[in-house]
Structures are given as structure tokens and as C-alpha cells.
């Protein structure tokens, strides 16, 4: 009686059940009561990364130097190329076709993760006791100077965008 | 129904070439894997090798790599075998078959 | 290349007798995906081989049930419960596991 459904890693074509190409490789043909499937192995600029029927390979991704990509990891016969972006450069999107500059924070807030080849600049802003006069991509918010410690006080109070202005103490009292 | 057919005879001079056919109906030719067999007068049989009509791929008895050379032409539903530099030595039937259904087979004499 | 071992060479037997072929492989014919393709093919004199068996054990439509193919790795029997005239006619094993393919040398069954 003709199989309805296959094992894993097999297909179901003219009541048989065949064998799927390993990852790597294509299909060149079907099996029959007579052959095994067939398969190749993909061409040097191609992929499949599953088991499969498929009679075409997948193209490698490319990474276009004019939209900021470069290669992270060079695909095989079983892999996609991986693309990442140039230094100062981000992923617009998950699939990373192409790249934008990291976003700077503003004066009044600093750096709370570093962007990568994947994901942008996260910024905050700076809390009480902390401030942030430029605008970086790097920066973290920096604690306002400590007037006490270097025997001095306080003569203009800081902001988030400002450190404190320390001053002589008055010697007069 | 299945059918594979093949003209009956060739009579070729040594160091010829000859140029076999095989026409396939009663099926999707690109389905099943061309499969071509020698036999000698009064011998046993002989795999030269498989052709796959819808790929082109092939396989051949190392023995006759540098003899015979497998082709399909799809739009007349045909298999080709070319055999080269031809001796006495290749005087046989020679067999196209699906394995299941086989041609009649060409008788192939060669003689000056 | 795997050779593929038959006998008995001759094969005399009476109509309605039980007939028994053998056919060793040098080598365990199962393929890496765990397939065995052995096949077994009645030739009849001036006649094109016929596909009895498949796969060891499947008989090929419209082969009588009289027919029966069994064995695993490298030994392999065909059997004949009644012999029937029609029967009559040289026996091939084939393997189609491991390339090249290889016949056996064949089984002439004939009359006692």
C-alpha cells in the first residue's frame, strides 16, 4: 500500500517516499522505485541551509559596500553571508540591507548603551548630580564635580546640561 | 503504455563513431533515469551507465567513460549514446531501459 | 566495483518444480541511505530483459505470485514456486546500490 505520510527528512512524490537533500545541496532528482534521490552540492555563491527539495540554491547575501555593509561572516554552502555595518554605521533594519549613522545624544543626555554594528545609540537623560555638555555617540552622563572635596563650594548649581561652578569659601565670616 | 523504442540494427566501419537513439513515450521522460546496458553475442549484460533526462546528470561505468557518452534532447523525447573509436570489440546489442521497461535494443556490428 | 556471483551457472528443472537461484555480492549491497537495490530480470532467447523483482522483495506488476525475491546484504534468492514453461530463459541479478552497477553472470534455467 502507497505511504501517505513520510519519516522526517523525506517527502512524499508518486506514492514513494524520498529521501530530502541535506543542507548544502540541491535536487537534482526525485527517487523512484529504481534511484535514490539525487542531489548536488550547491556552487560556491550559494546556499541551502535545510533539509530540503528545493532545485535551485539560494544566492549568498551580498554586503554593498556603498550602503555601509561589510562582511561579517562569509557564507558556506549551508550558511547565508552575515553583513554587519562599517564603523559609526547601524542596521536600519533586522535584515540589515542597509546602514545610518549612530544617533549622538544631545547636550543634557549621555550614552546608556553604546551603539553596535546592529543597533543604535541608546540615550538618557541625565539625572539629578549628573550632566552632559556635548553631543556624543559616546559620552556617558558625568557626575557634577564634588566643590567639598576639593575644599571649595559651590557658586553656580549644576544642570543636566552644566557641572556645578566651585568657588573659594568665604573667609570673611 | 511505457515504451522505449530503438532502431533494430547499425553496421559501422572501425574507428567510426555511432550515434544511438532511444525514444521514450507513455511516460514523463524527465522522471526516470535513462539506463544503458551492452551485451555481447551469447554473454551476459553489461551497465554502461544512467542518464537523467530532466537534470542531465549522469553516471557512468568507469569502463566506458572514454567510450560512451550519454545525451537527452527532451523536446523529442530521446536518449542518445555516442560511442567512440569503434573496434569489433564493441560489436553487441546495446539495451536503453527505464528498468522496468526496456527498448528492443540496436544489434551493432562493426566490420570493414 | 562490487561482483555479483550466481548459481547455479545451469539450471535444469521439470514443469511445476520448485526452482531456486542464488546471487552473492562481494560486498554488503545496502546503500547509505539504508536501500538495497537488487533487482532480478528473466531474458528470453532474442528477447530484451524483463523486470521481475525490485528492491529484493517487491515482484513488479503483473509478475505471477509464483515469483518470489528474498535476501539482505550480500546473499540474495530468487524463487520459482511452480515452474511454468514461459519461465524458461536466462535469470540476471542486478545491483543498482553502489556504482557501477553490476549483473550477475546469469542462471539458465531449462528443461530437465
Known amino acids: 500500500e502507497p505511504p501517505t505520510a513520510c519519516r522526517e527528512k523525506q517527502y512524499l512524490i508518486n506514492s514513494q517516499c524520498c529521501s530530502l537533500c541535506q543542507p548544502g545541496q540541491k535536487l537534482v532528482s526525485d527517487c523512484t522505485e529504481f534511484t535514490e534521490t539525487e542531489c548536488l552540492p550547491c556552487s560556491e555563491s550559494e546556499f541551502l541551509d535545510t533539509w530540503n527539495r528545493e532545485t535551485r540554491c539560494h544566492q549568498h547575501k551580498y554586503c554593498d559596500p556603498n550602503l555601509g555593509l561589510r562582511v561579517q561572516q562569509k557564507g558556506t554552502s549551508e550558511t547565508d553571508t552575515i553583513c554587519t555595518c562599517e564603523e559609526g554605521l547601524h542596521c536600519m533594519s533586522e535584515s540589515c540591507e542597509s546602514c545610518v549613522p549612530h544617533r549622538s545624544c544631545l547636550p543634557g543626555f549621555g550614552v546608556k548603551q553604546i551603539a553596535t554594528g546592529v543597533s543604535d545609540t541608546i540615550c538618557e537623560p541625565c539625572p539629578v548630580g549628573f550632566f552632559s555638555n556635548v553631543s556624543s555617540a559616546f559620552e556617558k552622563c558625568r557626575p557634577w564635580t564634588s566643590c567639598e572635596t576639593k575644599d571649595l563650594v559651590v557658586q553656580q548649581a549644576g544642570t543636566n546640561k552644566t557641572d556645578v561652578v566651585c568657588g573659594p569659601q568665604d573667609r570673611q565670616r | 503504455q511505457v515504451q522505449l523504442q530503438q532502431p533494430g540494427a547499425d553496421l559501422v566501419k572501425p574507428g567510426a563513431s555511432v550515434k544511438m537513439s532511444c525514444k521514450a513515450s507513455?511516460?514523463?521522460?524527465?522522471?526516470?533515469?535513462i539506463t544503458w546496458v551492452k551485451q555481447r553475442p551469447g554473454q551476459g549484460l553489461e551497465w554502461i551507465g544512467d542518464?537523467?533526462?530532466?537534470?542531465?546528470?549522469?553516471k557512468y561505468n568507469e569502463k566506458f567513460k572514454s567510450k560512451a557518452t550519454l545525451t537527452v534532447d527532451t523536446s523529442s523525447s530521446t536518449a542518445y549514446m555516442q560511442l567512440t573509436r569503434l573496434s569489433s570489440e564493441d560489436s553487441a546489442v546495446y539495451y536503453c531501459?527505464?528498468?522496468?521497461?526496456w527498448g528492443q535494443g540496436t544489434t551493432l556490428t562493426v566490420s570493414s | 566495483d562490487v561482483l555479483m556471483t550466481q548459481s547455479p551457472l545451469s539450471l535444469p528443472v521439470s514443469l511445476g518444480d520448485q526452482a531456486s537461484i542464488s546471487c552473492r555480492s562481494s560486498?554488503?549491497?545496502?546503500?547509505?541511505?539504508?536501500?538495497?537495490?537488487l533487482e532480478w530480470y528473466l531474458q528470453k532467447p532474442g528477447e530484451s530483459p524483463k523486470l521481475l523483482i525490485y528492491?529484493?522483495?517487491n515482484r513488479f506488476s503483473g509478475v505471477p505470485d509464483r515469483f518470489s525475491g528474498s535476501g539482505s546484504g550480500t546473499d540474495f534468492t530468487l524463487k520459482i514456486s511452480r515452474v511454468e514453461a514461459e519461465d524458461l530463459g536466462v535469470y540476471y541479478c542486478?545491483?543498482?546500490?553502489?556504482?557501477?552497477?553490476?549483473f550477475g553472470g546469469g542462471t539458465k534455467l531449462e528443461i530437465k
Open positions: 531501459a527505464r528498468r522496468d521497461y
Open positions: 560486498q554488503n549491497i545496502v546503500n547509505s541511505q539504508g536501500n538495497t537495490y
Open positions: 542486478f545491483q543498482a546500490s553502489l556504482v557501477p552497477w553490476t
Open positions: 507513455g511516460y514523463i521522460l524527465t522522471t526516470y533515469w
Open positions: 528492491k529484493v522483495t
Open positions: 542518464i537523467h533526462p530532466g537534470s542531465g546528470s549522469t
